[in-house]
Amino acid sequence: MMTGTIETTGNISAEKGGSIILQCHLSSTTAQVTQVNWEQQDQLLAICNADLGWHISPSFKDRVAPGPGLGLTLQSLTVNDTGEYFCIYHTYPDGTYTGRIFLEVLESSVAEHGARFQIP
């Protein structure tokens, strides 16, 4: 039975040209995390595999940095980076847990972080 929950940074804002950390955290389970995928709806940004380490998609190599931890840092943000980002935790023996983050990249200098929230 899957008992875990994914906590994410929820809805977040950042300034154009700046950087942001996408972070998910799996809690309430003793399952072993073996891989984490970072994705958008139609493309994969990065994979962190326990055995193979990090893989960053060539499309994002210049602007994406692995970490901190299992998170992902997006740099040199543009308004086109606005949208949904998904963390997909592959675990043993539970299976997969997924979380959603919505990033809004703002033109102005008023960019506030949204509240943290949980996805069961």
Partner: antibody, heavy 121, light 107 residues
Framework: QVQLQQSGAEVKKPGASVKVSCKAS????????IEWVKQAPGQGLEWIGV????????NYNEKFKGRATITADKSTSTAYMELSSLRSEDTAVYFC??????????????WGQGTTVTVSA | DIVMTQSPSSLSASVGDRVTITCKAS??????VAWYQQKPGKAPKLLIY???YRYSGVPSRFSGSGSGTDFTLTISSLQPEDFATYYC?????????FGQGTKVEIK
Amino acid sequence: QVQLQQSGAEVKKPGASVKVSCKASGYAFTNYLIEWVKQAPGQGLEWIGVINPGSGGNNYNEKFKGRATITADKSTSTAYMELSSLRSEDTAVYFCARRGDKYGSAWFAYWGQGTTVTVSA
Amino acid sequence: DIVMTQSPSSLSASVGDRVTITCKASQDVSTAVAWYQQKPGKAPKLLIYSASYRYSGVPSRFSGSGSGTDFTLTISSLQPEDFATYYCQQHYSSPRTFGQGTKVEIK
């Protein structure tokens, strides 16, 4: 349990259009992406496109852009794939499929039974 | 588009045999590969996702491995119900693409 029920077989003339439906049940329709896949007779699988039923946003294989239109009706939990300007090479079985996890990667865990479309003069 | 090339295109095997099907991607797809089984007149069934993760309810005789460009589906001891066509698929980028299929037939 999750079910994707597709509409029945269609026979169409070249140049016509066909609209295939895929009615979802057993889960929250707006939370999961729906994909469409083509399989020509004796051939492999070819991805057509995807829709997010919650937002209506979609993405297409370039090969089908302009001829395929994928839509979703939240009120009936039904996804549609319309193919226009039909030609003989569109004769195929068309499947709808759902990703395995909410927000999940594009592996397809649940499939409709398939709809056979025959294009013949 | 990423091209997925499967081999062999068909093979003959007996019940109890160990069967290996390979899939080669035209570019690095990390571990973003799924495997499906399809029987005539039926929809495909998901066996493996992310190269090596067995989907819920799939028998343990099915296993997947590989990363980068080379991937393998192994059936450790072929059962009568395993005679079917198997497809690999990359879930790395759009458009999603499939291998051409490997038909596993009874020897």
